[in-house]
Interface confidence: medium
Amino acid sequence: PRSIDVKYIGVKSAYVSYDVQKRTIYLNITNTLNITNNNYYSVEVENITAQVQFSKTVIGKARLNNITIIGPLDMKQIDYTVPTVIAEEMSYMYDFCTLISIKVHNIVLMMQVTVTTTYFGHSEQISQERYQYVDCGRNTTYQLGQSEYLNVLQPQQ
């Protein structure tokens, strides 16, 4: 079998809401993946599991099942949404994200995604990790790749 390539493209959109009384930020982050099937037979994308970390803490998880079938030598772009919550020990971020005096409230999040594909009863898992900028101060739609955080080191939060 040839490879199945998974490429994390980036954040497509981030929709934010707040709970002032709970000092809580709710971020619905939609991400985009390109999955390429380099085989001469179809493969099934069985599931996508994703999680988002802020400052080494998991703030959101998602799992999509029975997603799609990718034909031979074909590529599909898949969007998946991870609902995240920044609260409690991280409630100090509420003040930053709602600060009116600054226009952009970028925070660095680590996106982790694992794609499970199956073909002829065989299962394969491919994982990716990327740091991304997300604006926690407003609803934002990104050009693909626009939210990339290029520093390969663990960011200081």
């Epitope: 707040y18 002032v20 009384q21 409690e88």
Partner: antibody
Amino acid sequence: QVQLQQSGAELAKPGASVKLSCKASGYTFTNYWMHWVKKRPGQGLEWIGYINPSSGYTKYNQKFKDKATLTADKSSNTAYMQLSSLTYEDSAVYYCTREGGSISDWYFDVWGTGTTVTVSS
Amino acid sequence: DIVMTQAAPSLPVTPGESVSISCRSSKSLLHSNGNTYLYWFLQRPGQSPQLLIYRMSNLASGVPDRFSGSGSGTAFTLRISRVEAEDVGVYYCMQHLEYPYTFGGGTKLEIK
């Protein structure tokens, strides 16, 4: 119906500790935060802090940081507040109150029966 | 900390008349989302406090519509029209915009 049943009155000596309980019934305990409020005779109400029973996360009024310890037992749907190093100023009625509602609409909608703590030598 | 002030410690009132209880905060309780984070509670003699008003002007479930809340960012009023004997007790305002939550000193409503 939704109820918060608090433990009975406590009589304690200065320097001692007491542990007050607040048993929740009629709702899903882990879905709501539990706050504690102090009422001294002839004085107003003071907010002590809260616990999120789901995660165990606590937030305290700085004034009570070294005085009160909030815990919760999910298996018995009970919130606890331990008061340590008691002084006469700790003599008061202590209330637990549930913070209920929905996103951006939270309020103290249910209050416990109150526990009277008397510190006396 | 935000300081909540209730200027009148007690308020004598005749049944059937209207009364206003005032409360001030040392900082605006009006959030940028348009909500004003102020509660009003009533503590009847020998009872636990009960919620009357949340977010400055919203009537809590089961509370008679004789009660109403109003105000600006720092000055608030609880109005009781047609006071009844069961309305006696101590009325507290409380801010829940910022931690620590803070209460006013209370206003005791007494029947003349």
